[in-house]
């Protein structure tokens, strides 16, 4: 039985041109995380964090994606096209795979606030 829980930053908004932290956290399990994959709404891989090998940022995102904090991801120079779903996939053993979802809305407005509350999807 998979006992763990993925907590994510949930639904967040950020300003165009700004940056945002995408954060997932796996809790309530002793499972060993072998790899965390970060995917965009169109299922393209942004980055991989492997326990043995460290971070790999995919070439298409190298200029705009920074690893961390922790197993999270920082998206920079946001454009309106960045609006959409983001997924963190935790590959673990013995539990198997855990998946978390974050929805990012990029706003033109200068009053856009980056809400970073944690919630369980």
């Amino acid at each position: 039985m998979m006992t763990g829980t993925i907590e994510t930053t949930g639904n967040i908004s950020a300003k165009k041109g700004g940056s945002v932290i995408l954060q997932c956290h796996l809790s309530s399990t002793m499972a060993q995380v072998t790899q965390v994959n970060w995917e965009q709404h169109d299922h393209s891989l942004l980055a991989i964090r492997n326990a043995e090998l460290g971070w790999h940022i995919y070439p298409a995102f190298k200029d705009r994606v920074a690893p961390g904090p922790g197993l999270g991801l920082t998206l920079q120079s946001l454009t309106m096209n960045d609006t959409g779903e983001y997924f963190c996939t935790y590959h673990t053993y013995p539990d198997g795979t855990y998946r978390g979802r974050i929805f990012l809305e990029v706003l033109e407005s200068s009053v856009a606030e980056h809400s970073a509350r944690f919630q369980i999807p």
Epitope: M1, M2, H25, S27, S28, T29, M30, A31, Q32, V33, T34, A51, E52, G54, Y93, P94, D95, G96
Partner: antibody
Amino acid sequence: EVKLVESGGGLVQPGGSLKLSCVASGFTFSSYTMSWVRQTPEKRLELVAEISSSGGSTYYPDTVKGRFTISRDNAKNTLFLQMNSLKSEDTAMYYCARPGLGAWFAYWGQGTLVTVSA
Amino acid sequence: DVLMTQTPLSLPVSLGDQASISCRSSQSIVHNSGNTYLEWYLQKPGQSPKLLIYKVSNRFSGVPDRFSGSGSGTDFTLKISRVEAEDLGIYYCFQFSHVPRTFGGGTKLEIK
């Protein structure tokens, strides 16, 4: 090279306390679940404590629950085992161990001996 | 708890012989993920245990190919095709498909 070095063992009286340490090197300590395993004088192996990579989750078998506390300092690459209310049956060699490649105890330290005796 | 029973307790062999150690679990150790998390360790005299086999049949890095693991469900076997002097020690099976994770009692491989 993965290296795990335990320390802190020794002779302690029943009811006493001891704190074991395990210093890790050669890998990203904060990425791994870590465990303490003990081996009794009769050579039986028993998992006594586990802690998740962040330190947020811990596990203990009933034999040590409420007496032992596992913790970690990821900034110092160090794993700890605080042992209280020690009993003669806690006498054992204590090893820290790390998973890897789909295995639970891929790497072991050299061990530190704990003797509980009056 | 999953009880891991190893047989025999002691296994006297001649160098060059094949050795076989059995490990039986009190219930299936197939994890919900479909994997069977059964491992074999060797503890040589005066040393800490070392991983030989993981997930039933996968040799850990640096482990000679004379060691092989097999089995499924509740019955598992470690075979050493040609025993060498450096293989002597205590062999343990271990499962982590279920909590609490449990070891077998050990099998001592010794010279006949």
